[in-house]
Amino acid sequence: MAPWPELGDAQPNPDKYLEGAAGQQPTAPDKSKETNKTDNTEAPVTKIELLPSYSTATLIDEPTEVDDPWNLPTLQDSGIKWSERDTKGKILCFFQGIGRLILLLGFLYFFVCSLDILSSAFQLVGGKMAGQFFSNSSIMSNPLLGLVIGVLVTVLVQSSSTSTSIVVSMVSSSLLTVRAAIPIIMGANIGTSITNTIVALMQVGDRSEFRRAFAGATVHDFFNWLSVLVLLPVEVATHYLEIITQLIVESFHFKNGEDAPDLLKVITKPFTKLIVQLDKKVISQIAMNDEKAKNKSLVKIWCKTFTNKTQINVTVPSTANCTSPSLCWTDGIQNWTMKNVTYKENIAKCQHIFVNFHLPDLAVGTILLILSLLVLCGCLIMIVKILGSVLKGQVATVIKKTINTDFPFPFAWLTGYLAILVGAGMTFIVQSSSVFTSALTPLIGIGVITIERAYPLTLGSNIGTTTTAILAALASPGNALRSSLQIALCHFFFNISGILLWYPIPFTRLPIRMAKGLGNISAKYRWFAVFYLIIFFFLIPLTVFGLSLAGWRVLVGVGVPVVFIIILVLCLRLLQSRCPRVLPKKLQNWNFLPLWMRSLKPWDAVVSKFTGCFQMRCCCCCRVCCRACCLLCDCPKCCRCSKCCEDLEEAQEGQDVPVKAPETFDNITISREAQGEVPASDSKTECTAL
């Protein structure tokens, strides 16, 4: 795989470096420029001279006016102005607005519900496997294994709170130490960021929208990965999280509090519990090595049960096994004792779809996974459509200005921190960082929120989810209070440390640059988004898991050369962009590597071959449906084929960008090809009425 896509004919020019306005943030960002960017998106991109460290030049045909894909699009209001409407028109418009708001809230509701069902589906499909990951004894000695288990389990159960609660119960039961639990919590933090990345994939239809949405979602991923990359070795070396949290727990005499308020669950639970209800204790029991739990179903059958505590007489091998000497007797042959047994009597069945089907967990999980993804996708499309029709012209300008504009000088720096607080507060309200960041993703996609603003909101979301965990810990029973609170605090301080690393100084906001880079690549090669998801959330963790099981020697033997190669490539890239003259001629570019190692183009050809046939069939079907629909509603402009079909048509026409002049972009070394040729202002003809 290429170190970075399309660096084939890179000829670094040490004399001049060019970059678009929305590019690499300088150390002291020009805030007026950002405001301008929000207001006037049609303006040509200004070229700024930059230090060599910020870009790499690649030869590509340079248009006279370059559209920066990271500029927010201006949503043109094609409707009649309010002042030009008559009374009837105004009333109609008002009710139309109310209708849109109701629809928006309705779709938003089902969007959140589908996220909940998606989590349940993942738990049914991979929950038991996730539980078994925890029963691995090597976690205690291998922090790297703990980390990947945290990632895998959270990805499999689609809920960091589930994996965290398993860790808490294991620590409470002394099956795990707090020290061993910290890497798992770090992994859970990474795993939880997959949800909004999946949500971003749903916006794959529009290139420019997808570029922004995917970058906005993956900024969370990169923040978590980079934080772990720095903080895991620091924690292993110093145990600072363990020490700080231990001091806090020991210095305060906490009294059991109340449960964190379930604000969003109150609204969504009535619906989601009609679809499926899970017995989440089963995963915890598997993690605690309970053999009986392995055969239990995660699908809850009985919702109303009567638990009767009774004493029964049982035989024991010897009097030493008696519950107490006074509760010990003999029948002359065997020793007997009295045991407290909890007899569970099933009273009423749960009221959900799958209660009487008696299907295996995998089948129920697969059904729910497909359905929830369809609903998620459908809701997202509708939310984007409604928002697109509402956020036009003046409304869009006001909203974008409000969200993306900074405080006046000298308080501009405070804006981001306020956004962190807003993110934390919103997450605390919805009780889920996944829900908040997933709701944020389409807003980034349609251009309401900039990535620069979404970043602190996401960081705040990370904090918000830990405050919820702290409140939940305070509500734990006596024996679990200490361990659950310490773990929740570890999670909190880990995120605080991450923010301190990757937010205060604009230069250190690497996750934004990396996310934009990935957004550029994924917009051009949309299959790469799925590839990224599989690699980062499944293959890498599973590989590390497998190597860890093989032992330290194998892990080091494979890991060290891989890390060495990555460092070597990064160093080489850094030298190529900053001071290429110190390098031999051959190493000044990547041409010495075969094309498949330095470009995604050959890989794209392979992927296109596989998907092409399916795409063709899909598009033919799409066109037939569209034409039938248009005939029925007698509206020639009411419907368009999906974006994929347009792209397919473009590809068939054989349009290509000739390589000529140098141009650079915001990501450290991303080519024009990765940038994607579809401009941000790609307008579509559609009816504004819903």
Partner: antibody, heavy 119, light 107 residues
Amino acid sequence: QVQLVQSGAEVVKPGASVKMSCKTSGYTFTTNNMHWVKQAPGQGLEWIGAIYPGSGATAYNQKFKGRATLTADKSTSTAYMELSSLRSEATAVYYCARGMYGHGAMDYWGQGTSVTVSS
Amino acid sequence: DIQLTQSPSFLSASVGDRVTITCKASQDVGTAVAWYQQKPGKAPKLLIYWATTRHSGVPSRFSGSGSGTEFTLTISSLQPEDFATYYCQQYSSNPLTFGQGTKLEIK
């Protein structure tokens, strides 16, 4: 109703052996333990041992171990006790008693078998 | 072995009297104690088990109490048929042991 009928009185010589029976009826023989209790003339009660007919498991009072052997025949619902190497101290009335399920109280007793050891 | 000591060994009482027989164990036996009645030439008959539970068919005038090491059998109002020898038995551990007996005679 539950009944335990024991074999008749025995007069034996010292050093000899005696095997007495206890035929049961009115309940499932294999579910309850069968206890054997000795009562010497003018003395109190002394537990010899017990057998669980279902599995043939036995337990003995250390004092009688090696001298008493308890067996059971499920087909005839009969319990047996064999006393060997008899001495004059073995002269007593021997009772079989049904143990209550799950504990050591004895709810039904046989009429007793009188054993006299005399030369 | 657990020793059980009954007191008194002999007891004279009249019909209608309230009689109490005690049984002391050499160690804690919980409530694993039974009481038996034996008439001359007859097999013992179970009266009480689990220290306090009356066996089926046993008149209500018989009651048991106690736990741990001290137990009592009480006959609230003596009847002519109640004159016999009474034994306590522990089944807390093997071997099962009986008290030496309390002989209840007519005054």
